[in-house]
């Protein structure tokens, strides 16, 4: 469960800042990329690389962005309507358990295992025994065998709120 | 782990409104990080987004169905509420309810509703 | 609205079979699509975000690429629980839009 946005994930807004632009709210929302002023007469739009949102909203400020944290590189920026995409590093991967942290990825199986799944920035290596095919789960044994993993694979996020 | 459950009757008679209740456990809708939506999904299998709410009442409704949609909350009882008006047979669908993943960098929708299926006959 | 156009509506494979799935947007979205997966009287599951990326817990026999308005899922080797319709869903603008279904049948 991603935590509660509290007041510190808004980003005020300056409403006199000259370079936001402004917009009239339709039926009292205010488009992506946009949050509503306080009188509810305006729409004003995020700070580009600072703050987001990415819906119709009446939200009085847009939400803060993500900054990626030192473990993981930013896939695509913070844009007015996008929060940030963070992912792991190479070699390295986000557990369901522990969203919190990139951990490294295996380097190879234990004995009478074999690999079957590359390290992924969402999943370690997968290991199953080479009799029954069963997925091996729990701690790796100190030791292993010389199959290694060979990091790679489509992008997959760090970070998964504002 | 969050988990969702419509409710509803499941026979609705033409040019009646169709009622429909969605039930969050496991996570608490005043959450600030989610949206929560209504999809419904034709006999033929096409999947039709039919609109959002926020945990703060704000809502956006499909400009399809925009006219006889009305969608609405009760944090108190961690429910969502979906209410068509006008009903016809061509709004006999498996209505679903999800979570829009929407305040982050991504919007998708997870998890689901096992779906509930509603009949518009007489 | 943008459309999502799916092919092809179905396709017969055999277990191990490397099958692709393509969704073309009607117009330009970047990257951001979505690839589900839906079994008969199921709800659809969450596959594949951002075009590329998989949800926690899917198989890396799944992949996902493309942006713009050109798409693919790819089945590496295809097992017997993926058979199943895959939808595709645009998040680029409201109002959210789904593909018309793919359906990945027995051989």
């Known amino acids: 469960e991603s935590a509660l946005i509290t007041q510190q994930d808004l980003a005020p807004q300056q409403r006199a800042a000259p370079q936001q632009k402004r917009s009239s709210p339709s039926e009292g929302l205010c488009p992506p990329g946009h949050h509503i002023s306080e009188d509810g007469r305006d729409c004003i739009s995020c700070k580009y690389g600072q703050d987001y949102s990415t819906h119709w909203n009446d939200l009085l400020f847009c939400l803060r962005c993500t900054r990626c944290d030192s473990g993981e590189v930013e896939l695509s920026p913070c844009t007015t309507t996008r929060n940030t995409v963070c992912q792991c590093e190479e070699g390295t991967f986000r557990e369901e358990d522990s969203p919190e942290m990139c951990r490294k990825c295996r380097t190879g199986c234990p004995r009478g295992m074999v690999k079957v799944g590359d390290c992924t920035p969402w999943s370690d290596i997968e290991c199953v025994h080479k009799e029954s095919g069963t997925k091996h789960s729990g701690e790796v044994p100190a030791v292993e065998e010389t199959v290694t993993s060979s990091p790679g694979t489509p992008a997959s996020p760090c970070s998964l709120s504002g | 782990q969050v988990q969702m459950q419509e409710s509803g009757p499941g026979l609705v008679k033409p040019s009646q409104t169709l009622s429909l209740t969605c039930t969050v456990s496991?996570?608490?809708?005043?959450?600030?990080?989610?949206?929560w939506s209504w999809i419904r999904q034709h006999p033929g299998k096409n999947l039709e987004w039919i609109g959002y709410?926020?945990?703060?009442?704000?809502?956006y409704y499909n400009p399809s169905l925009k006219s006889r949609v009305t969608i609405s909350v009760d944090t108190s009882k961690n429910q969502f509420s979906l209410k068509l008006s006008s009903v016809t047979a061509a709004d006999t669908a498996v209505y679903y309810c999800?979570?829009?993943?929407?305040?982050?960098?991504?919007?998708?929708?997870?998890?689901w509703g096992q779906g509930t299926l509603v009949t518009v006959s007489s | 609205d943008i459309q999502m156009t799916q092919s092809p509506s179905s396709v017969s494979a055999s277990v191990g079979d490397r099958v692709t799935i393509t969704c073309r947007a009607s117009?330009?979205?970047?990257?951001?699509l979505a690839w589900y997966q839906q079994k008969p009287g199921k709800a659809p599951k969450f596959l594949i975000f951002?075009?590329?990326s998989l949800q926690s817990g899917v198989p890396s026999r799944f992949s996902g690429s493309g942006s713009g308005t050109d798409f693919t899922l790819t089945i590496s080797s295809l097992q017997p629980e993926d058979f199943a319709t895959y939808y595709c869903?645009?998040?680029?603008?409201?109002?959210?839009?789904f593909g018309q279904g793919t359906k990945v049948e027995i051989k």
């Open positions: 117009q330009g979205i970047s990257s951001w």
């Open positions: 999800a979570r829009d993943n929407g305040s982050g960098s991504y919007d998708w929708f997870d998890p």
């Open positions: 869903q645009q998040a680029n603008s409201f109002p959210r839009t």
């Open positions: 709410i926020y945990y703060s009442g704000s809502t």
């Open positions: 951002v075009a590329s």
């Open positions: 496991g996570g608490s809708i005043s959450s600030g990080d989610y949206y």
